[in-house]
Interface confidence: medium
Amino acid sequence: VEVQVSEDPVVALVDTDATLRCSFSPEPGFSLRQLNLIWQLTDTKQLVHSFTEGRDQGSAYANRTALFPDLLVQGNASLRLQRVRVTDEGSYTCFVSIQDFDSAAVSLQVAAPYSKPSMTLEPNKDLRPGDMVTITCSSYQGYPEAEVFWKDGQGLPLTGNVTTSQMANERGLFDVHSVLRVVLGANGTYSCLVRNPVLQQDAHGSVTITGQPMTF
């Protein structure tokens, strides 16, 4: 028996359902009584879901998995994972045994988009050219860790005095805080771009300082 899975990682948004595709080619006369199907975590070998002895043995993994029972006889051994969490990320092995066996692994990449960044300025009044200011760009509830870029009004990168911290919350999602320390020019725009590398999602925030007043 030959097992086939998608070579590309399956990307799933947090809280949505994901399908880990796996198929095999049943021989003529194939019956589900002959099928042993195991989904397991590749690294730890933890059982996720199984079908043996002619019946679905059910989910062994947080009761959030299901097979496609009507499609099994056609060789569709795909696994549905419901309400995806950050902790579900990783490699899953689809193991099919009829008389001989084969297995293949598929990767699940979990993702969550970052919120539109909020910008804060410190100090935020009585600013003059030459003052040192701290601009903070904050974006929330994304996954995986973000890439953060700062640019000036001409779109040129600001690489100097930048400190970025990313903290995971209880759901494993990241809150990003990036701090730029810069000496004010006569006027200028400071932009922050928070990029989700998996979703290729860019979230933009900017602050424009034109003497007085400031716009965000």
Partner: antibody, heavy 121, light 107 residues
Framework: QVQLVESGAEVKKPGSSVKVSCKAS????????ISWVRQAPGQGLEWMGR????????NYAQKFQGRVTITADKSTSTAYMELSSLRSEDTAVYYC??????????????WGQGTLITVSS | DIQMTQSPSTLSASVGDRVNITCRAS??????LAWYQQKPGKAPKLLIY???YLQTGVPSRFSGSGAGTEFTLTISSLQPDDFATYYC?????????FGGGTKVEIK
């Protein structure tokens, strides 16, 4: 390379039980089946049953149903075969065997060294 | 259970001979047949699986053929190391069964 190491030879009285262990190393234990095959002196091979450790499911040959129990301890990568109500015809070498990571639940690339169980009063 | 019948039960042959061992199943088993070699005091060794697939590391003088109910193990040129007992095993069903064995001895 999978290695299967069985417990030592035993002499048992008729009517008693015996439990043979089989410790696996060098490969994946939990996903693949461990079978037990016995061979009486000068006789052929006889399949007794198997366990798939990850599922905790065991299947037995009809002849041994009700008299044999196969279990597995994933934490120690060890499979066990217990045979009860022993009689003299159960005197045999008992092998554990599996297909390793590359073959099958049903054919056996790897075998233990065998455990001789002698049933005698 | 599926019965497996091997013939002959004993075969006398010389080094260099071509040897055929037959295995018959009591019902069709497709190609789900394996062959093993066993030497005295040792565990069996897998030679052929799925009727005709040579197990890794097994010399090419061993070959398997057949499907359905009739199967043959062939040793194209018998070597001194090949004197042993050979067993067929069906795995068409969950319940596995072996043939009674064929002892290949020196003529």
């Amino acid at each position: 390379q999978v290695q299967l190491v069985e417990s030592g030879a035993e002499v048992k009285k008729p009517g008693s039980s015996v439990k043979v262990s089989c410790k696996a190393s060098g490969g994946t234990f939990s996903s693949y089946a461990i079978s037990w095959v016995r061979q009486a002196p000068g006789q052929g091979l006889e399949w007794m049953g198997r366990i798939i450790p990850i599922l905790g499911i065991a299947n037995y040959a009809q002849k041994f149903q009700g008299r044999v129990t196969i279990t597995a301890d994933k934490s120690t990568s060890t499979a066990y075969m217990e045979l009860s109500s022993l009689r003299s015809e159960d005197t045999a070498v008992y092998y554990c065997a599996n297909g390793g990571d590359s073959s099958s639940w049903y054919t056996f690339d790897y075998w233990g060294q065998g455990t001789l169980i002698t049933v005698s009063s | 259970d599926i019965q497996m019948t091997q013939s002959p039960s004993t075969l006398s042959a010389s080094v260099g001979d071509r040897v055929n061992i037959t295995c018959r199943a009591s019902q069709t088993i497709n190609s789900w047949l394996a062959w093993y070699q066993q030497k005295p005091g040792k565990a069996p060794k897998l030679l052929i699986y799925k009727a005709s697939y040579l197990q890794t590391g097994v010399p090419s003088r061993f070959s398997g053929s057949g499907a359905g109910t009739e199967f043959t193990l062939t040793i194209s040129s018998l070597q001194p190391d090949d004197f042993a007992t050979y067993y067929c095993q069906q795995y068409n069903s969950y319940s596995l069964t072996f043939g009674g064995g064929t002892k290949v001895e020196i003529k």
